[in-house]
Interface confidence: low
């Protein structure tokens, strides 16, 4: 730990004296205490030496020297008294704020240690400190109130006897706050309310606070409602309640209701919406498109929101087909909030047989309502190329399946190659109107494209390339001259 020169723990000087406090340490140090503006730091050794050329009672206090590099190494203190018969007290603060239950330090420091046995604490106006207030005097710190209470809030003066005469400090205002000094806690119940015209309703506005001095009102819009106030006192908290009870609600009762509670600290407000409807309702909506497209193997969640009053009594998710073989049990959850439900259907790694219609049905006193999703699966193209003579002419057939409907491009390339792009191709044909062989709902589209060649050219490779939003695929056909025969080679190329 650092060493202070002169050695302490206390130093007593007369007003007007020069006082130098030096802190000796291996590293840089920092002084803490009632320093500014009564001291100067020695420019030769900044941080380590404090000097005052003309000590006054305001220099009275505890000075601490701490090592900056290693605060854990500890610190050293010295308490300086500047004994001035004209000023028995040095006040380090005029106002002290603590939380109830804490120690409250009233920092009136005695300037002469010889006076410490005759000190006393009084309330301003010459009144004694409250009998239940437990306090003691520390010459270095001042008067310390143990377990300060709200009742201890007051202006205090410190007194001592100097040469048989009373010397009194100026006042220190002690403010003792509650553990939670804040506006009242409020609750407005329910947080949302719907009623059919003619039904009964209750809105309860309640507030709790540690002190009794607070107010609570219930408003509809800007209108303060004249409702009797019920009060209670529980576990040392005051509770005030205004409850609006309506036997048969009408449309004029609807609106925004506010619960407002206020005290000296501030105001808290809670609001809720009261809706009056003509009859029961059940509305089903989805933020998603009702026409869903996903790739085979993907997962998705179908989400439906229901706004309903009164409560939904029954609901169910149903698969309406068209594929009824190999059906998994539907997995869904329901989340409920006030007058609002969220229904979620989980479709995990969907298979071909799970495409189709999904139907949510819900019922309350308003009747039944439903919503249908159509789930179409996307498939990458699958391609097959065949050759057939038609009326003595060579024709290549490209059969393609997939969803969405794939596009078809033919390419003629020189040589026996298994790769060919448009830049290398001798000819390119885009089939903009292939023949649709099959187009069933929720299933793959099957199309056929024909390439009438006339006579297959020797040493050429013909490619049928297909593409959709999911992927692409191609297959080639080679013309091999073996007399009059045409041969489809064994190898074929498929690129998903």
């Amino acid at each position: 730990a650092p060493v202070i020169e002169p050695s302490g723990p206390e130093l007593v000087v007369e007003p007007g004296e020069t006082v130098t406090l030096r802190c000796v340490s291996n590293g840089s140090v920092e002084w803490d205490g009632p320093i500014s503006p009564y001291w100067t730091l020695d420019p030769e050794s900044p941080g380590s030496t404090l000097t005052t050329r003309n000590a006054t009672f305001k220099n009275t206090g505890t000075y601490r020297c701490t090592e900056l590099e290693d605060p854990m190494a500890g610190s050293t203190t010295i308490h300086l008294y500047v004994k001035d018969p004209a000023h028995s007290w040095n006040l380090l603060a005029q106002e002290v704020t603590v939380v109830e239950g804490q120690e409250a330090v009233l920092p009136c420091l005695i300037t002469d240690p010889a006076l410490k046995d005759s000190v006393s604490l009084m309330r301003e106006g010459g009144r004694q400190v409250l009998r239940k207030t437990v306090y003691f005097f520390s010459p270095w710190r001042g008067f310390i109130i143990r377990k300060a209470k709200v009742l201890d809030s007051n202006t205090y003066v410190c007194k001592t006897m100097v040469n048989g005469r009373e010397s009194t400090s100026t006042g220190i205002w002690l403010k003792v706050n509650r553990v939670h000094p804040e506006p009242p806690q409020i609750k407005l119940e329910p947080s949302k309310l719907v009623r059919i015209r003619g039904e009964a309703a209750q809105i309860v506005c309640s507030a709790t606070n540690a002190e009794v001095g607070f107010n609570v009102i219930l408003k509809r819009g800007d209108t303060k409602l004249e409702i009797p106030l019920n009060s209670d006192f529980q576990d040392n908290y005051y509770k005030k309640v205004r409850a609006l009870s309506l036997n048969a609600v009408d449309f004029q009762d609807a609106g925004i209701y506010s619960c407002v509670a206020s005290n000296d600290v501030g105001t808290r407000t809670a609001t809720m919406n009261f809706q009056v409807v003509e009859s029961a309702y059940l509305n089903l909506t989805s933020e998603q498109s009702l026409l869903q497209e996903v790739s085979v193997g993907d997962s998705l969640i179908l989400t439906v929101h229901a706004d309903a009053y009164p409560s939904i009594q029954h609901y169910n998710w149903t698969y309406l087909g068209p594929f009824f073989e190999d059906q998994r049990k539907l997995e869904f959850i329901t989340q409920r909030a006030i007058y609002r439900y969220t229904f979620k259907l989980f479709l995990n790694r969907v298979k071909a047989s799970e495409a189709g219609q999904y139907f949510l049905m819900a019922q309350n006193k308003a009747g039944w309502n439903n919503l249908t999703f159509e789930l179409t699966l996307r498939y990458p193209p699958e391609v097959s190329v065949t050759w057939m003579p038609v009326n003595g002419s060579d024709v290549l057939f490209c059969d393609v399946s997939g969803y969405p409907q794939p596009s078809v491009t033919w390419m003629e390339c020189r040589g026996h190659t298994d790769r060919c792009d448009e830049a290398q191709a001798l000819q390119v044909w885009n089939d903009t109107h292939p023949e649709v062989l099959s187009q069933k709902p929720f299933d793959k589209v099957i199309i056929q494209s024909q390439l009438p060649i006339g006579t297959l050219k020797h040493n050429m490779t013909y490619f049928c390339k297909t593409h959709n939003s999911v992927g692409n695929s191609s297959q080639y056909f080679r013309a091999v001259s073996l007399g009059q025969s045409k041969q489809l080679p064994d190898e074929s190329l498929f690129t998903p």
Partner: antibody, heavy 119, light 106 residues
Framework: DRQMVESGGGLVRPGRSLKLSCAAS????????MAWVRLAPSKGLEWVAS????????YYPDSVQGRFTISRDNAETTLYLQVDSLRSEDTATYYC????????????WGQGVLVTVSS | DTVLTQSPALAVSPGERVTISCRAS??????IHWYQQKPGQQPKLLIF???HLESGVPARFSGSGSGTDFTFTIDPVEADDTATYYC?????????FGGGTKLELK
């Protein structure tokens, strides 16, 4: 010095009534919340009643509500507990205590008085 | 009502450190208070608001915790500390006490 002395206990038959007293001295009785807490044999402490400094507000747990009545006389610096329809489970040592003004804990306790309910 | 659970009994030797726990069935913030009751005597407040030492109580006694878990510590234990120690909550209504922990010295 603060003192609280309970009296009025003893052996009572089930169904009968009893009034306990607590004479307080050495402190400003009228400034304090007061309470009764009991300790039944082989059981823990149980708070049974509290009263505000003025006597305007009284507080009871549900377990004794309607059978126990707490009251005070600030002029006589005395606290009372009226116990009606006594049951065997009311057998306990009853303590009067000062309740802290800001929180419901009990900072000073009397010596206690034993109430035995038995036929 | 809020239930406070304490271990029923402990036996320690003088000079040792002893810790008594109090668990609440629901949060009680820091409104837990500790009492000592010696045989044949009235209870005495030792700690209030979880950690505040009542004036006149030796610094050997201390308390800590908030929410639902609280600890009361005596360090070091003295022969005169033989007693039953109760925790009490005042956050929820009604105020309730724990069942007490009987501390015996070996």
């Amino acid at each position: 010095d603060r003192q609280m002395v309970e009296s009025g206990g003893g052996l009572v038959r089930p169904g009968r009534s009893l009034k306990l007293s607590c004479a307080a001295s050495g402190f400003t009785f009228s400034n304090y919340y007061m309470a009764w807490v009991r300790l039944a044999p082989s059981k823990g402490l149980e708070w049974v009643a509290s009263i505000s400094p003025s006597g305007d507000n009284t507080y009871y747990p549900d377990s004794v509500q309607g059978r126990f009545t707490i009251s005070r006389d600030n002029a006589e610096t005395t606290l009372y507990l009226q116990v009606d329809s006594l049951r065997s489970e009311d057998t306990a040592t009853y303590y009067c205590a000062t309740r802290h003004y800001g929180y419901s804990f009990f900072d000073y306790w009397g010596q206690g008085v034993l109430v035995t309910v038995s036929s | 009502d809020t239930v406070l659970t304490q271990s029923p009994a402990l036996a320690v030797s003088p000079g040792e450190r002893v810790t008594i726990s109090c668990r609440a069935s629901e949060s009680v913030s820091t409104l837990i208070h500790w009492y000592q009751q010696k045989p044949g005597q009235q209870p005495k407040l030792l700690i209030f608001l979880a950690s505040h030492l009542e004036s006149g109580v030796p610094a050997r006694f201390s308390g800590s915790g908030s929410g639902t878990d609280f600890t009361f510590t005596i360090d070091p234990v003295e022969a005169d500390d033989t007693a039953t120690y109760y925790c009490q909550q005042s956050w929820n209504d009604p105020p309730t006490f724990g069942g007490g922990t009987k501390l015996e010295l070996k």
